[in-house]
Interface confidence: low
Amino acid sequence: QAAPFPELCSYTWEAVDTKNNVLYKINICGSVDIVQCGPSSAVCMHDLKTRTYHSVGDSVLRSATRSLLEFNTTVSCDQQGTNHRVQSSIAFLCGKTLGTPEFVTATECVHYFEWRTTAACKKDIFKANKEVPCYVFDEELRKHDLNPLIKLSGAYLVDDSDPDTSLFINVCRDIDTLRDPGSQLRACPPGTAACLVRGHQAFDVGQPRDGLKLVRKDRLVLSYVREEAGKLDFCDGHSPAVTITFVCPSERREGTIPKLTAKSNCRYEIEWITEYACHRDYLESKTCSLSGEQQDVSIDLTPLAQSGGSSYISDGKEYLFYLNVCGETEIQFCNKKQAAVCQVKKSDTSQVKAAGRYHNQTLRYSDGDLTLIYFGGDECSSGFQRMSVINFECNKTAGNDGKGTPVFTGEVDCTYFFTWDTEYACVKEKEDLLCGATDGKKRYDLSALVRHAEPEQNWEAVDGSQTETEKKHFFINICHRVLQEGKARGCPEDAAVCAVDKNGSKNLGKFISSPMKEKGNIQLSYSDGDDCGHGKKIKTNITLVCKPGDLESAPVLRTSGEGGCFYEFEWHTAAACVLSKTEGENCTVFDSQAGFSFDLSPLTKKNGAYKVETKKYDFYINVCGPVSVSPCQPDSGACQVAKSDEKTWNLGLSNAKLSYYDGMIQLNYRGGTPYNNERHTPRATLITFLCDRDAGVGFPEYQEEDNSTYNFRWYTSYACPEEP
């Protein structure tokens, strides 16, 4: 007998009855590997309360239709004196991933499951070349489900400072390059779930083989291996492999992008902090409200419910969509359908379809996104039941008394997408969450400018246009409210920009939207400030311009206008530079992504060294070469001499390897005289070169001793970028 759903055959699946503390293991094509359930059990029930096992479905006694799979047993059950046998029934529905079997209910005799999976679809449009189970239950039978992260087309770009390679991954399944418009992925070999793009070549560095694993609480691991036997030449004889560790964040925050933490010998280690790695109970609700202690979230959408026969209407070109939230659409031609979303053809209003039913509802909050899903609608030609996905966005100034209205954004294979701006979707202020921007592979991070708490101070903008008598102080914070300290003590609590003068303080805008890359710079817009007349509110734009090495310059007020409704600041800062780490030899470094090239060899002293004096010590340092000063060791790049007794320490061996990252050039000297600590840590020196166009060669300044490293700061014109 041929297996009814071959895609699901390679794995043993799990489902849970949380109410009764029961774990089911399911193998639809063979038998589960649990001795206690016997040699032919297809569905094995493990009762954790009584610590007992029962086979509730025998692989030999299987019967199947296109959408239903039944496993009988030889065990009788007592159901009102009938001679029934214990059995399991799995109803299959078309889904967009392999999905997960969900426990529905159990009677004395029958254990019911439902499974939304690509394996049940009439057409192959959602089917992957290779896909593995993408969920796991922890010891407390809580489900961790990464299915929402699976991309049906395209891939995730892994964040890595290496500009020469791009690693693209999908979660639990191969990358569908055919449906992806991006040209970079088209060269990826079929079946790959981890595709490494080097120049114009793409390599398969991993395919899914095993399902998701739980390594410890809130830490999930997915491993990909390269199936092809041939070695890749850049892997030094090693077979490529990819390990993705999904980490549940300790507090609510927007999801990060996957980050490459190691890549030696083609063993790619990726860490991805995402709320999808957390157990699902906190993040999903079958009702219209949702709260999660861990995520620090409390949401209630019930005020959006319409009653008295009215619905929200959304225009979808050929169709009109009638929607209600937290209840049925009470439109006459939709009645009896129990539809939360009702699709009506404009040209023929008798053609009515339920695009999701109100009792099939999931409210999901994860990674900063609030989504309401209505599934179980009328079937379409592929066999997939219509469903609607409403993505809510926080908008405190939404119309319709803050309720806003849903907007149809598109349809993909019988799934209808809407966005809905409403104040009821606002989840506490997103601070520290959206403090960067991306532009393709280029990443920008403004978090270095964020001032969190005292003793830090707000940034104060420079305004050259004012006289001392009319002096206005402009206090700014980045991606955060201004700190209520000093002259900003009286600033409105939620202001991210605040103006203070003799008359008091004013909110010039709140941090509501994340920074954007625009015309080569980063734009940060703060809106919803104090009223400025005519029903308008003050808005502030900050243009952040890349200035390598400078994280200290203040913002400058450029203009203010529109009757005090608009302020514009400009800020030259290293935080606006593209994040990319580049290493160079021979005292030069070239950052191809930012287009900067640097040559610090003019700073190398052929004889002698640069001297930096402090109270107790004299420091002698050279750039990309050894210091030639008595009594310093001849191969040291930096050395420390005690003024009292001329005792000398080597602070690191000289080298000429510069690194450039985040607008700063650094030179590391390592392997100096060991400390007298337990581990005998060798002393090391870090010199950070910063751009000052007027400094010429400049000179080193001693900063501080930190973790066995001596830090020097050096302002010099040679650290200023020049176009190659």
Epitope: D164, T177, P190, H200, A202, P724
Partner: antibody, heavy 117, light 106 residues
Framework: QVQLQQPGAELVKPGASVKLSCKAS????????MHWVKQRPGQGLEWIGM????????NYNEKFKSKATLTVDKSSSTAYMQLSSLTSEDSAVYYC??????????WGQGTTLTVSS | ENVLTQSPAIMSASLGEKVTMSCRAS?????MYWYQQKSDASPKLWIY???NLAPGVPARFSGSGSGNSYSLTISSMEGEDAATYYC?????????FGGGTKLEIK
């Protein structure tokens, strides 16, 4: 093992067109870019362009954009380069080359194209 | 386009002699690749990623450099090393080659 087979020679009249072939074997044809390189007698090498058999994506050297057209036939694992409006300047050896974890790890034997009346 | 200039264009060396040839790029490149070509034969990849020897290349060959300046060195010339060597950059399209250095036996 990886092999790129090219015909040894082609003789064509000025003004005509020619379609050079490169048959690949020993690897999955759709996994790698195929490059084409020109070498005039006694001269250096010039990169013409490349094509990816999986999607047909191409990238040309601007200098050869109006001269060369790259195509593939996945079913026969063959890459083609059509050269049009031929002149004596086009007389050269044309190589196809395939990456090997790095550029141009494998080369065809080259096709000697002679443009002569 | 990034122009690669190889020098010298022709050089001769005695057996056992150390040989160095250079390749300068008009714009900085990430890596340099070198190919060996003997008469009437296809080029062969010789050095990749600036300093890695392709399979089968004798250990007497080495490559170095960064930015705009790269070189190929033979520590001790042998008869089979007589050939033309081309450098090539793969940093930016079009992927240019140098004009070649022809190495002959003295």
């Amino acid at each position: 093992q990886v092999q790129l087979q090219q015909p040894g020679a082609e003789l064509v009249k000025p003004g005509a067109s020619v379609k050079l072939s490169c048959k690949a074997s020993g690897y999955t044809f759709t996994n790698y870019w195929m490059h084409w390189v020109k070498q005039r007698p006694g001269q250096g090498l010039e990169w013409i362009g490349m094509i990816h058999p999986n999607s047909g994506s191409t990238n040309y050297n601007e200098k050869f954009k109006s001269k060369a057209t790259l195509t593939v036939d996945k079913s026969s694992s063959t890459a083609y380069m059509q050269l049009s409006s031929l002149t004596s300047e086009d007389s050269a050896v044309y190589y196809c080359a395939r990456p090997h974890g790095y550029p141009f790890g494998y080369w065809g034997q080259g096709t000697t194209l002679t443009v002569s009346s | 386009e990034n122009v690669l200039t190889q020098s010298p264009a022709i050089m001769s060396a005695s057996l056992g002699e150390k040989v160095t040839m250079s390749c300068r790029a008009s714009s900085s490149v990430n890596y340099m690749y070198w190919y060996q070509q003997k008469s009437d034969a296809s080029p062969k990849l010789w050095i990749y990623y600036t300093s890695n020897l392709a399979p089968g290349v004798p250990a007497r060959f080495s490559g170095s450099g960064s930015g705009n300046s790269y070189s190929l060195t033979i520590s001790s010339m042998e008869g089979e090393d007589a050939a033309t060597y081309y450098c090539q950059q793969f940093t930016s399209s079009p992927y240019t080659f140098g004009g070649g250095t022809k190495l002959e036996i003295k």
